[in-house]
C-alpha cells in the first residue's frame, strides 16, 4: 500500500499501516463527466468484430449485474457483410474490482475481488505459428 | 439493493436494510479462472484499431493506477499498414468501480466511485449523416 499522511479528522483505525479492512460508503459518486460523452452502445453492432452482451447476475456481488461481451465470429466482418477469416475477432478484457459479500448473505460485510470481464471485441491480425 | 436473508454469523450492523457504509476486506481475491486465458496484452498492437495505454495515477484512489487506452488513429489500419479513413477507430469504454479516500488522505475510509475508462479500441463503420 502507499504511505499516506494520516489526517486527524479520519475515522479511528487500529492499524496505522495500509488497512486490511476499511469502511466504504456505498453512496456512489459518479465521475463520468467525459469530454466525449458518446456512449459505446451501438459499437457492438457497427464493429468489424461485433459482439453480443450477456447479463451476468450474482446477488452476492456488488454490482450484482455485469454485462459480458462475446464476439459473434472468430473472423472479422468485411464491408460487404461477409466474414474475413484471415483476421481474428478477439475479446478486449479488463480486470475490474467488485465487492463480494463475505460471509455469504451478509448485508454489510464485503471482500474486494478482482474479476476479468470482456468489454467488447477488436479485430486483430492473426498470430502466425510457424512450423519448424 | 437486493433483500438478502441476514446470516447470524454476520458482523453487527445498525441498519438492517441495504447498507450505506460497509466493512470491506482489502485482501483481494482473484477470480480470474478463465477457460480462455489468452491475455489481451498484445492486442493493442495487432488490432486494426490500435491503441496506446496511458498510466493514470491517483494516490487518493484504490486502485491508484489505472491504464487508459487512447486510439492511435481516427481511421482503421488496413492489411498494407495504411490507414483507411472510411472506417473509424473508437474507444470501448467501461464504467468501473474504484474506492476514493474520503475524507482525503484517510487510510481506512473510502467512498465507492464510478469512473469511465477506455479499455481498448475497435474498428466501426461510420455513421453516415445525410444532409437534407
Amino acid at each position: 500500500g502507499i504511505a499516506i499522511p494520516r489526517n486527524s479528522g479520519c475515522p479511528n483505525s487500529e492499524d496505522k499501516n495500509f488497512p486490511r479492512t476499511v469502511m466504504v460508503n456505498l453512496n456512489i459518486h459518479n465521475r463520468n463527466t467525459s469530454t466525449n460523452p458518446k456512449r459505446s452502445s451501438d459499437y457492438y453492432n457497427r464493429s468489424t468484430s461485433p459482439w453480443n452482451l450477456h447479463r451476468n447476475e450474482d446477488p452476492e456481488r456488488y454490482p450484482s449485474v455485469i454485462w459480458e461481451a462475446k464476439c459473434r465470429h472468430l473472423g472479422c466482418v468485411k464491408a460487404d457483410g461477409n466474414v474475413d477469416y484471415h483476421m481474428n475477432s478477439v475479446p478486449i478484457q479488463q480486470e475490474i474490482l467488485v465487492l463480494r459479500r463475505e460471509p455469504r448473505h451478509c448485508p454489510n460485510s464485503f471482500r474486494l475481488e478482482k474479476i476479468l470481464v470482456s468489454v467488447g471485441c477488436t479485430c486483430v491480425t492473426p498470430i502466425v505459428h510457424h512450423v519448424a | 439493493g437486493i433483500a438478502i436473508p441476514r446470516n447470524s454469523g454476520c458482523p453487527n450492523s445498525e441498519d438492517k436494510n441495504f447498507p450505506r457504509t460497509v466493512m470491506v476486506n482489502l485482501n483481494i481475491h482473484n477470480r480470474n479462472t478463465s477457460t480462455n486465458p489468452k491475455r489481451s496484452s498484445d492486442y493493442y498492437n495487432r488490432s486494426t484499431s490500435p491503441w496506446n495505454l496511458h498510466r493514470n495515477e491517483d494516490p487518493e484512489r484504490y486502485p491508484s493506477v489505472i491504464w487508459e487506452a487512447k486510439c492511435r488513429h481516427l481511421g482503421c489500419v488496413k492489411a498494407d499498414g495504411n490507414v483507411d479513413y472510411h472506417m473509424n477507430s473508437v474507444p470501448i469504454q467501461q464504467e468501473i468501480l474504484v474506492l476514493r479516500r474520503e475524507p482525503r488522505h484517510c487510510p481506512n475510509s473510502f467512498r465507492l466511485e464510478k469512473i469511465l475508462v477506455s479499455v481498448g479500441c475497435t474498428c466501426v463503420t461510420p455513421i453516415v449523416h445525410h444532409v437534407a
Epitope: 453480443n52 462475446k70 459473434r72 465470429h73 481474428n88 478484457q93 498470430i127 | 478463465s34 477457460t35
Partner: antibody, heavy 124, light 113 residues
Framework: QVELRESGPGLVQPSQTLSLTCTVS????????VSWIRQPPGKGLEWMGI???????DYNSAFKSRLTISRDTSKSQVFLKMNSLQTEDTAMYFC??????????????????WGQGASVTVSS | DIVMTQSPSSLAVSIGETVTLNCKSS????????????LAWYQHKSGQSPKLLVY???TRQSGVPDRFMGSGSGTDFTLTISSVQAEDLAIYYC?????????FGAGTKLELK
C-alpha cells in the same frame, strides 16, 4: 429441464411461406441464442440461421434473401418464416439452443439441446 | 462453404467392439488465438432429436459416457467409441463452428453386424 418444441403446418404449397414456431422451456431467450437447422430426406443437417440472446440475427447466405428469424421473449417463442418455398425445401426442421459457456468470450455455435423436429412437405 | 467429409458412411459393428469415425474439414478448424479446434460431434437416434456428444474436438458434454472420445486437430478429426453398446447405434454427425455457415458432415451410420 431444457426443452424445445417445433410446431407448424406439415404441408405447404409451392411458392407459399413457411411459418414455424419453436416454444422453449427450462431456459430464457434473453440468456441464450437459438438456431434453426433443417434436414432434407436422406440428406445431412443444414444450419439455417440464428437469433442471438439480444434479438440480433445471422443467416446462412443460402437462405438470406427469404429467411426471417424472430422471437417473442414473453412467450418463450422463436419463429422461422421462409418465403418462396420449393419442393427442395421439404425437410425436417429443428430448432436448437446454442451452448452457453461462462468465461468463454465468443458466441457458441454448438447446439446443446434440440427439438424433436417439425416435418414439412412442400407439395401442391 | 466449408465441406465436412465423414467416413465411412456406414459401419457395421459388434457389441463391445471399439470403432473409429472420421471427419475431414476442407479448411483448418484451429483458431490461432486460443488453440481450440471448432469441431463437435452429435449422435442422432431414429425418432429422437440430435444430441451433442463432444465439442472443441475433445471436450465431452456433461452426461456423455467416457467411452466417447474425440481427437484430432486442423482438418482431421476422429470420434472413437470404445466398447460399443446397443444404445450407441445411431447416425453420428460432425459439425464445424469456425466458419459461417456452420456446416455438418453427411453422417456415419453405426449399425449392428
Amino acid at each position: 429441464q431444457v426443452e424445445l418444441r417445433e410446431s407448424g403446418p406439415g404441408l405447404v404449397q409451392p411458392s407459399q411461406t413457411l411459418s414455424l414456431t419453436c416454444t422453449v422451456s427450462g431456459f430464457s431467450l434473453p440468456s441464450h441464442s437459438v438456431s434453426w437447422i433443417r434436414q432434407p430426406p436422406g440428406k445431412g443437417l443444414e444450419w439455417m440461421g440464428i437469433i442471438w440472446n439480444n434479438g440480433g440475427t445471422d443467416y446462412n447466405s443460402a437462405f438470406k434473401s427469404r429467411l426471417t428469424i424472430s422471437r417473442d421473449t414473453s412467450k418463450s417463442q422463436v419463429f422461422l418464416k421462409m418465403n418462396s418455398l420449393q419442393t427442395e425445401d421439404t425437410a425436417m426442421y429443428f430448432c436448437a439452443r446454442n451452448m452457453y459457456i461462462t468465461d468463454y468470450y465468443y458466441e457458441n455455435y454448438f447446439m446443446d439441446a434440440w427439438g424433436q423436429g417439425a416435418s414439412v412437405t412442400v407439395s401442391s | 462453404d466449408i465441406v465436412m467429409t465423414q467416413s465411412p458412411s456406414s459401419l457395421a459393428v459388434s457389441i463391445g467392439e471399439t470403432v473409429t469415425l472420421n471427419c475431414k474439414s476442407s479448411q483448418s478448424l484451429l483458431f490461432s488465438e486460443n488453440q481450440k479446434n471448432y469441431l463437435a460431434w452429435y449422435q442422432h437416434k431414429s425418432g429422437q432429436s440430435p444430441k451433442l456428444l463432444v465439442y472443441w474436438t475433445s471436450t465431452r458434454q456433461s452426461g456423455v459416457p467416457d467411452r466417447f472420445m474425440g481427437s484430432g486437430s486442423g482438418t482431421d478429426f476422429t470420434l472413437t467409441i470404445s466398447s460399443v453398446q446397443a444404445e450407441d447405434l445411431a447416425i453420428y454427425y460432425c459439425q464445424q463452428s469456425y466458419y459461417t455457415p456452420y456446416t455438418f458432415g453427411a453422417g456415419t451410420k453405426l449399425e449392428l453386424k
